[in-house]
Amino acid sequence: EEELQVIQPEKSVSVAAGESATLNCTATSLIPVGPIQWFRGVGPGRELIYHQKEGHFPRVTPVSDPTKRNNMDFSIRISNITPADAGTYYCVKFRKGSPDVELKSGAGTELSVRAKPSAPVVSGPAVRATAEHTVSFTCESHGFSPRDITLKWFKNGNELSDFQTNVDPAGKSVSYSIRSTARVVLTRRDVHSQVICEVAHVTLQGDPLRGTANLSEAIRVPPFLEFTQQSMRADNQVNVTCQVMKFYPQRLQLTWLENGNVSRTEMASALPENKDGTYNWTSWLLVNVSAHRDDVKLTCQVEHDGQPAVNKSFSVKVSAHPKEQGSNTAAENTGTNERGSSDYKDDDDKHHHHHH
């Protein structure tokens, strides 16, 4: 009689998570009588997966009816595979006894589980940065197997090259995680920009997963300030405007100071958006020139997104004129009959841009 051989025809089997895995095993002889057992791993720590004779194995079913006469097919099917099921499975023949005696093992079948990566999650910097600065974006995806995976970064459709990627763990594992950090240089035009992290894996059948982040969450575009002064009106009032231009985000407070004293404070709200995603805002102040003996120093002070204030000052020149009794010494949005002349002098800009 030929000596019993236990044949596991496949060296390896790859199965998608959630599917069933069939592990094939046949014996070449009915002799000796005794059960088959399936184990994962070898040695004293091996894990019993299926015992033909005894035990309850709800996820495992024999492919061939074990009661079938002359049965030599000991293949099993494991249902609802998860990455934790990965490993090498051995079909082992035992000789009937008390207890049964291990006789011969198959060569083993390595089960690898194809598990899809989770949707990539892209996170940006905790604080905003201004143009010309470099910010880091991180992309993470978890739970995939096998380990081979491709990750790409894009900004507005253009592939980025400045990034570093790690797949963990380095050794064998049931599933893996990827983490990549990309460095992106901001420009003033990036309010509408997007960074995309794209993950390609064998389980995705050529349809990569994408995670996105909007640069609008990471960028701060500081405003430009500009003054205009309309010529003196008949009622001795001058309309001065402070134009706050090309800023993002919208969070902005503007304060008018006359000779260093706060005249008015306003908060920006519900502003229309420019094409590039930035905002403009114009604030005006009526200065009653006849109420002043000396030149008036006007300051437009802008606090943008919690940053230190940006100031722009200029002087309204007041020519000598008789002061009527009862008139205001400083007027805002008020009219008098006094006439006077004024010259407009734009002081040096005092822009204090503080970057992180």
């Epitope: 009915l30 002799i31 009588v33 033909q52 002359n70 049965n71």
Partner: antibody
Framework: QVQLVQSGAEVKKPGASVKVSCKAS????????INWVRQAPGQGLEWIAM????????HYNQIFKDRATLTTDTSTSTAYMELRSLRSDDTAVYYC????????????WGRGTLVTVSS | DIVLTQSPDSLAVSLGERATINCRAS??????????IFWYQQKPGQPPKLLIY???NLDSGVPDRFSGSGSGTDFTLTISSLQAEDVAVYYC????????FGQGTKLEIK
Amino acid sequence: QVQLVQSGAEVKKPGASVKVSCKASGYTFTNYWINWVRQAPGQGLEWIAMIDPSDSETHYNQIFKDRATLTTDTSTSTAYMELRSLRSDDTAVYYCAMDYGSLYAMDYWGRGTLVTVSS
Amino acid sequence: DIVLTQSPDSLAVSLGERATINCRASKSVSSSGYNYIFWYQQKPGQPPKLLIYLASNLDSGVPDRFSGSGSGTDFTLTISSLQAEDVAVYYCQESWELPTFGQGTKLEIK
């Protein structure tokens, strides 16, 4: 280890029925055939029938086909053999036996149940 | 149905001597290298015990003084050196078709 524990002795009148039970332990009940064999006093072994507890497939000796019925209860790992229309020559020890190698052999045996048919 | 005929019906052998029991099938019970014959030992008041399966393979725990041989239709159970505890009735069984037993051979000590 494998154990087959049979029900106790029965005394029946001719024409009656008897149902013998066989409770299995020490193995997966649904993975092995159960055979029923009888032995009249001082006589040889006579195979009655066999059942696969996983799907209740049965094979009967033609001699017993019309009078014997095999059943199983997988929830209690118990096999039953009912014999109807008893005659005096049905007096015998009835054995259940497990086929461990799926070779239609009898590897493990119960201790037997004596059924006496007498008027 | 296959009929199994054992010979002799009874046998007396001295302790330490060889005992041989034959079993003949009414048709071949061999196929693909397997011989579908089984041998059982039954002692008084006990159920039968499987000794040999597929004609020549000793079941677990059976002393190696027992052996089986044969193919086709003719099979033999041999006890190489009879021991007192071997006194019993021996049955052959075929499973080529549905199981049938031989009529039994009673083995005694001479």
